[in-house]
Amino acid sequence: CKAMHVAQPAVVLASSRGIASFVCEYASPGKATEVRVTVLRQADSQVTEVCAATYMMGNELTFLDDSICTGTSSGNQVNLTIQGLRAMDTGLYICKVELMYPPPYYLGIGNGTQIYVIDPEPCPDSDF
């Protein structure tokens, strides 16, 4: 089958500081040297790009400076971290992988990771 399978966890719970991490793993049908990873958020049938990074195999992922994502790569596995999440950001986060170079191009889209974000309770006023 000339397709690329992408695996990611079904559910992740963000930390109380609004940070969520998950692994995106892809089964590469070719020997890519350049890979692009995009995180998409799907909510109410609307799709938005959360962040994207292109990296050379063996090198680190480089997201834009103002990106809410960071990540590291190891072989065909990408460890993604999304920061600054709030309860309203709860949704399905989909990992999309593209083998950019050399040809042929391959596209792989994961089933998505449902990220649950719970805003921390405000600290009660202290009498001390």
């Epitope: 089958c1 000339k2 799709v47 999309k96 042929p104």
Partner: antibody
Framework: QVQLVESGGGVVQPGRSLRLSCAAS????????IHWVRQAPGKGLEWVAV????????HYADSVKGRFTISRDNSKNTLYLQMNSLRAEDTAVYYC???????????WGQGTLVTVSS | EIVLTQSPGTLSLSPGERATLSCRAS???????LAWYQQKPGQAPRLLIY???SRATGIPDRFSGSGSGTDFTLTISRLEPEDFAVYYC?????????FGQGTKVEIK
């Protein structure tokens, strides 16, 4: 709203060159791969070329490799197709199309006709 | 290169009838990466179905897609006058991007 508008088509002699343009609006141009697809008169759709995101990566159909060059100017939201050494079999309507996040081509231009004839 | 073969070449039907269009791939295609387009004379193609079975924005529910592996189907449950057109399948999981040769749905 998303719009793609092609221009630059016309009649050209075999062996000559032509440059097509595709002006995009209504979306973040640099976040999408953009393709050229052509359709010979009365025939089906044939993929021609694609250029990705920042413009560094490109892929071509074997039928145009070495003759056609795809490029983009993200500051102008414009896609180009430089067509050299044109042949009669390159006669077609040329469409630019946006590849959406999931992979299919969700928006197409109206097309521009290229006729290669002596 | 994945070759897509559509059948039949032409389908002659009346409004209100059901249309079943077939697309067969030369090798297995992930259903996530199979699309259907509609094209009317003098117009650009329009995306109908992606991921083999998901309807694109604004596409009426009389259009449905199904299939996996090498065999895919586009079904139009009840043909409306505006549905008479040429339909193309496409795979977009790997380069080169390929289209079927098209099926023309014409009025009987």
């Amino acid at each position: 709203q998303v719009q793609l508008v092609e221009s630059g088509g016309g009649v050209v002699q075999p062996g000559r060159s032509l440059r097509l343009s595709c002006a995009a609006s209504g979306f973040t141009f640099s976040s999408y791969g953009i393709h050229w697809v052509r359709q010979a008169p009365g025939k089906g759709l044939e993929w021609v070329a694609v250029i990705w995101y920042d413009g560094r990566n490109k892929h071509y159909a074997d039928s145009v490799k070495g003759r056609f060059t795809i490029s983009r100017d993200n500051s102008k939201n414009t896609l180009y197709l430089q067509m050299n050494s044109l042949r009669a079999e390159d006669t077609a309507v040329y469409y630019c199309a946006r590849q959406d996040y999931w992979g299919p081509f969700d928006y197409w231009g109206q097309g521009t006709l290229v006729t290669v004839s002596s | 290169e994945i070759v897509l073969t559509q059948s039949p070449g032409t389908l002659s039907l009346s409004p209100g009838e059901r249309a079943t269009l077939s697309c067969r791939a030369s090798q297995s295609v992930s259903s996530s990466y199979l699309a259907w387009y509609q094209q009317k004379p003098g117009q650009a193609p329009r995306l109908l179905i992606y991921g083999a079975s998901s309807r694109a924005t604004g596409i009426p529910d009389r259009f449905s897609g199904s299939g996996s592996g090498t065999d895919f189907t586009l079904t139009i449950s009840r043909l409306e006058p505006e549905d008479f057109a040429v339909y193309y399948c496409q795979q977009y999981g790997s380069s080169p991007w390929t289209f079927g040769q098209g099926t023309k749905v014409e009025i009987k």
